[in-house]
Interface confidence: medium
């Protein structure tokens, strides 16, 4: 999906007001300093992409973000204010709903969701140039 | 199939309150979403208000301590309490459940006018 057609500054402000304060809970009793942000991106567009990929794509060792809190505030705000998105994610979804798995945090989970506030505090802050 | 019933809407003058419903049927799975839209003439449908599974919700700034919506899950059905109404929250007003796969319902007018 190509997300250059998003309308940001809504998606900023759902961040700001929600989905932020999700990510801290998820993480919460791990130490800010725990993990490196490896994952970085350039601008809006490539940051959400990333973002997607983060948070909907399972990873070895990390199964389960799809059905936490951010993730379905995040796929809200995808659907919503990215033009077309909720109708490539039909398939997914549906998909994701029959292999409905038990929850669980693992340290692979805390580090990508780590990584996830990375990406969106580089979102939030477009004009910055990549370091 | 799920369907989605909005209601309540009407008019009323400056100042007045209104209180929308939307009424959720058929096969409903894991429902984590509810939302309100509007959509006035000539203009592209906004995002209003939304409330999570959690009990968390999202305010567009235009209707922030003017707007409250809430949810009773047992019932399947959304509502939006509209206080201090203004001529610009004439629109036709929308739900919509969950958003993987967006669903609408067929809206409500609600129309501010003295």
């Known amino acids: 999906y190509d997300f250059t057609n998003c309308d940001f500054e809504k998606i900023k402000a759902a961040y700001l007001s929600t989905i932020s304060k999700d990510l801290i809970t998820y993480m919460s009793g791990t130490k800010s300093t725990e993990f490196n942000n490896t994952v970085s991106c350039s601008n809006r567009p490539h940051c959400l992409t990333e973002i997607q990929s983060l948070t909907f794509n399972p990873t070895a060792g990390c199964a389960s973000l799809a059905k936490e809190m951010f993730a379905m505030k995040t796929k809200a705000a995808l659907a919503i204010w990215c033009p077309g998105y909720s109708e490539t994610q039909i398939n997914a979804t549906q998909a994701m709903k029959k292999r409905r798995k038990r929850k669980v945090t693992t340290n692979k989970c805390l580090e990508q969701v780590s990584q996830l506030q990375g990406l969106w505090r580089r979102f939030n802050r477009p004009l910055l140039k990549q370091q | 199939e799920v369907q989605l019933v909005e209601s309540g809407g009407g008019l009323v003058q400056p100042g007045g309150s209104l209180r929308l419903s939307c009424a959720a049927s058929?096969?409903?799975?894991?429902?984590?979403?509810m939302g309100w839209f509007r959509q006035a003439p000539g203009k592209e449908r906004e995002l209003v208000s939304a409330i999570f599974s959690d009990g968390s919700t999202y305010y567009a700034d235009s209707v922030k301590g003017r707007f409250t919506i809430s949810a009773d899950n047992s019932k399947n059905t959304a509502y939006l309490q509209m206080n201090s109404l203004k001529p610009e929250d004439t629109a036709v007003y929308y739900c919509a459940l969950d958003l993987s796969t967006v669903r609408w319902g067929q809206g409500t007018l609600v129309t501010v006018s003295s």
């Open positions: 058929g096969r409903i799975f894991s429902t984590y979403f």
